[in-house]
């Protein structure tokens, strides 16, 4: 499998972590989240060429079958391999609450 | 969130489990796998419209940001939520061995 940074399509074009700045309004959270007001959303974006950051055997199979049947089988997809935690302060009927989310911000990426 | 089977794009067009029949040659396994000669590969294929089978909070964020910035943020992607194990009979230097793979066949799917 290729090294995660060795993208055959050119630097930065393959599956990797990107940061997108989003307001509560962008996320549709303005009516239930108080803080933070803006989130630096880390997400996985980019192409998954042959065996690039293949997550597992399934990803390798998908690559092989996509090569054979590109109209039937899609290429592997760039998705989070793990997440970073985040705390949100939310509005509740009685005031505010602290809520912890472990599946909100991507930490690193792979192809599957 | 929509029910997993309630695809707004029409029946069978959203993220779901598909089976693709593949030979050892198709998979590039002919030189190291003896059996099975053919694999019923279960994989996740289909579109991920708004909140359809959203895996977690990250998938929900991705949907919101894709709607806002479709050229920057891709839609969520249909990937395995879990796997079924599979046994392969492999060639070895000394003969054959039985090997179980836990990450080869998709069991069910979600969008992320």
């Amino acid at each position: 499998a290729r090294n995660g940074d060795d993208c055959p399509l050119g630097p930065g074009r393959c599956c990797r972590l990107h940061t997108v700045r989003a307001s509560l309004e962008d996320l549709g959270w303005a009516d239930w989240v108080l803080s933070p007001r803006e989130v630096q959303v880390t997400m996985c974006i980019g192409a998954c060429p042959s065996q690039f950051r293949a997550a597992n055997m399934h990803a390798q199979i998908k690559t092989s079958l996509h090569r054979l049947k590109p109209d039937t089988v899609p290429a592997p997809c760039c998705v989070p391999a793990s997440y970073n935690p985040m705390v949100l302060i939310q509005k509740t009927d009685t005031g505010v609450s602290l809520q912890t989310y472990d599946d909100l911000l991507a930490k690193d990426c792979h192809c599957i | 969130a929509r029910n997993g089977d309630d695809c707004p794009l029409g029946p069978g067009r959203c993220c779901r489990l598909h089976t693709v029949r593949a030979s050892l040659e198709d998979l590039g396994w002919a030189d190291w796998v003896l059996s099975p000669r053919e694999v019923q590969v279960t994989m996740c294929i289909g579109a991920c419209p708004s909140q359809f089978r959203a895996a977690n909070m990250h998938a929900q964020i991705k949907t919101s940001l894709h709607r806002l910035k479709p050229d920057t943020v891709p839609a969520p992607c249909c990937v395995p939520a879990s796997y079924n194990p599979m046994v392969l009979i492999q060639k070895t230097d000394t003969g054959v061995s039985l090997q179980t793979y836990d990450d080869l066949l998709a069991k069910d799917c979600h969008c992320i």
């Epitope: 803080s35 933070p36 970073n84 302060i89 602290l98 912890t100 | -």
Partner: antibody, heavy 118, light 107 residues
Framework: QVQLQQSGPELVKPGASVKLSCKAS????????INWVKQRPGQGLEWIGW????????KYNEKFKGKATLTVDTSSSTAYMELHSLTSEDSAVYFC???????????WGQGTTLTVSS | DIVLTQSPATLSVTPGDRVSLSCRAS??????LHWYQQKSHESPRLLIK???QSISGIPSRFSGSGSGTDFTLSINSVETEDFGMYFC?????????FGGGTKLEIK
């Protein structure tokens, strides 16, 4: 750059009240939450409460309910903490801390020393 | 309330030493643990967030690890400017609580 400037030291009598201030500069006041933290001499840190500057919503540590009142004045970019019915146990350094992510405290004021003594 | 217990209370080290400071939570707090340094007569300074994430402007010799109930702050080669108090803080649930602190002093 983000700065939190706290009011000067206070010497007050038991039973009285005092209002400490924390003036923010270098950022949009409503973009950061303000927390207040107590530190008694030679001791650890205690979280008193949190306030959302945009509309003044606050959350208190149960231990400080009735003891502390948090308010903000957005026109002057200033957060306030009023402490009531003071006793010697309230003698401490009080910090305001600005938080972008509400989980932790990124920016701290220099602290205000409160001495309660007759 | 979640209780954070730091150990040791005092750590005497020589510049150049590698040190590890411990923070133990009374219940699982996932990764919701942050570390601060406080020098005498100064405000605390954030060193590490979410157990292991680095902070811009903080020297790379500071690192954090752990999850659940056991956390460690490591300084891989202590410098003279590192001496002072170190506190951990949890944000898993309100009220936020801090550990009692570890004093890092020169041997």
């Amino acid at each position: 750059q983000v700065q939190l400037q706290q009011s000067g030291p206070e010497l007050v009598k038991p039973g009285a009240s005092v209002k400490l201030s924390c003036k923010a500069s270098g950022y949009t006041f409503t973009s950061y939450d303000i927390n207040w933290v107590k530190q008694r001499p030679g001791q650890g840190l205690e979280w008193i409460g949190w306030i959302y500057p945009r509309d003044g919503i606050s959350k208190y540590n149960e231990k400080f309910k009735g003891k502390a009142t948090l308010t903000v004045d957005t026109s002057s970019s200033t957060a306030y903490m009023e402490l009531h019915s003071l006793t010697s146990e309230d003698s401490a350094v009080y910090f305001c801390a600005g938080t972008y992510d509400p989980a932790y405290f990124d920016y701290w004021g220099q602290g205000t020393t409160l001495t309660v003594s007759s | 309330d979640i209780v954070l217990t730091q150990s040791p209370a005092t750590l005497s080290v020589t510049p150049g030493d590698r040190v590890s400071l411990s923070c133990r939570a009374s219940q699982s707090i996932s990764y919701y643990l942050h570390w601060y340094q406080q020098k005498s007569h100064e405000s605390p300074r954030l060193l590490i967030k979410y157990a292991s994430q680095s902070i811009s402007g903080i020297p790379s010799r500071f690192s954090g690890s752990g999850s659940g109930t056991d956390f460690t702050l490591s300084i891989n080669s202590v410098e003279t400017e590192d001496f002072g108090m170190y506190f951990c803080q949890q944000s898993n649930s309100w009220p936020y609580t801090f550990g009692g602190g570890t004093k890092l002093e020169i041997k």
